[in-house]
């Protein structure tokens, strides 16, 4: 019962976690404009893994996708890859874990097979959670680095003067969603691995017992001929099996003190 509960809970926790990872990956608020120095900004900017958005104080919002893969920072590509790998592994893990659930009967699937599937899905959830946590952490590191590097400077550029505004970006909601979701997926995976131990059928250690007829040496020779053990004559009146049908009298014609115990 405890195993089923652990497995079920692990599945549910992982399901919530993976849903969170998908949500975080799709969210636009990975980095949001820091309004500490300029709280009365007419236009507010926030960015995600796939597009950048601007929002007016009126609430009107416009989002545009990033130009090309080539023009984007390598770190952003790495974050995208980590999140997608996390989602894919998590989705496969969920699929595997559905069939592994103890409460679901599929044909004549043995407990050992279910245990293996539970372990497999558990490992997948753990890796999925780690991918999500790693992806979010890499992006957070980019933000922190950028935050301290963004200092206002003026320089002359082509077509006039360009001023790099003191626009600093800070952690968006998606980062927190990603961290929590990754953690839940990881916990769910650990729970599945724990449940696997309980599902695995314990091997019964049978003590090796040697069964032998007390005092009888049985030699077999086909054709109904009486045979000895093959080593000398049958001096000790040992019971002989001839493979044929015999009467009760014949059976008792070779009495031995060990015959009846």
């Amino acid at each position: 019962m405890a195993v089923t509960a652990c497995q079920g809970l692990g599945f549910v926790v992982s399901l919530i976690g993976i849903a969170g990872i998908i949500a975080a990956t799709c969210m636009d608020q990975w980095s949001t404009q820091d309004l500490y120095n300029n709280p009365v900004t007419a236009v507010f900017n926030y960015q995600g893994l796939w597009r950048s958005c601007v929002r007016e104080s009126s609430g009107f919002t416009e989002c545009r996708g990033y130009f090309t893969l080539l023009g984007l920072p390598a770190m952003l590509q790495a974050v995208r890859a980590l999140m997608i790998v996390g989602i894919v592994l998590g989705a496969i893990g969920l699929l595997v874990s559905i069939f592994a659930l103890k409460c679901i009967r599929i044909g004549s699937m043995e407990d050992s097979a279910k245990a293996n599937m539970t372990l497999t899905s558990g490992i997948m959830f753990i890796v999925s959670g780690l991918c999500a946590i790693a992806g979010v952490s890499v992006f957070a590191n980019m933000l922190v680095t950028n935050f301290w590097m963004s200092t206002a400077n003026m320089y002359t550029g082509m077509g006039g003067m360009v001023q790099t505004v003191q626009t600093r970006y800070t952690f968006g909601a998606a980062l927190f969603v990603g961290w929590v979701a990754g953690g839940l997926t990881l916990i769910g995976g650990v729970m599945m691995c724990i449940a696997c131990r309980g599902l695995a059928p314990e091997e019964t250690n049978y003590k090796a017992v040697s069964y032998h007829a007390s005092g009888h040496s049985v030699a077999y020779k086909p054709g109904g001929f009486k045979a000895s053990t093959g080593f000398g004559s049958n001096t000790k009146n040992k019971k002989i099996y001839d493979g044929g049908a015999r009467t009760e009298d014949e059976v008792q014609s070779y009495p031995s003190k060990h015959d009846y115990v």
Partner: nanobody
Framework: AVQLVESGGGLAQAGGSLRLSCAAS????????MAWFRQTPGKQRESVAL???????NYADSVKGRFTISRDNAKNTVYLQMNDLKSEDTAVYYC??????????????WGQGTQVIVSS
């Protein structure tokens, strides 16, 4: 980089009209807002009008009711329709664009300026 090219400046009679335009080109992800500033010799650059990407406008008190700012989002172009011109409107007019150019990159770009002279 983003380039801003102003056009439409020149000589106008008091009470007359001029239409300035500013085209932005280059690596523009989001055009947050575009604005017009002006500067007269010996004075600081002052804001004339601003328009956000959503069309929200803001004008300096001295030009309210006379100037109209508009924009074409598809062309990343901003226009300043100046009516009922006065001699105090004589200045170099600068185009300004607040642009998101990439991931965690938001810059303010300036044009080279276009001269507007109002003769009385």
């Amino acid at each position: 980089a983003v380039q801003l090219v102003e056009s439409g400046g020149g000589l106008a009679q008091a009470g007359g009209s001029l239409r300035l335009s500013c085209a932005a080109s280059g690596r523009i992800l989001n055009m947050a807002s575009m604005a017009w500033f002006r500067q007269t010799p010996g004075k600081q650059r002052e804001s004339v009008a601003l328009i956000t990407f959503g069309g929200t406008t803001n004008y300096a008190d001295s030009v309210k009711g006379r100037f109209t700012i508009s924009r074409d989002n598809a062309k990343n172009t901003v226009y300043l329709q100046m009516n009922d011109l006065k001699s105090e409107d004589t200045a170099v007019y600068y185009c300004n664009a607040d642009v998101v150019t990439g991931l965690m990159r938001r810059d303010v770009y300036w044009g080279q300026g276009t001269q507007v002279i109002v003769s009385s």
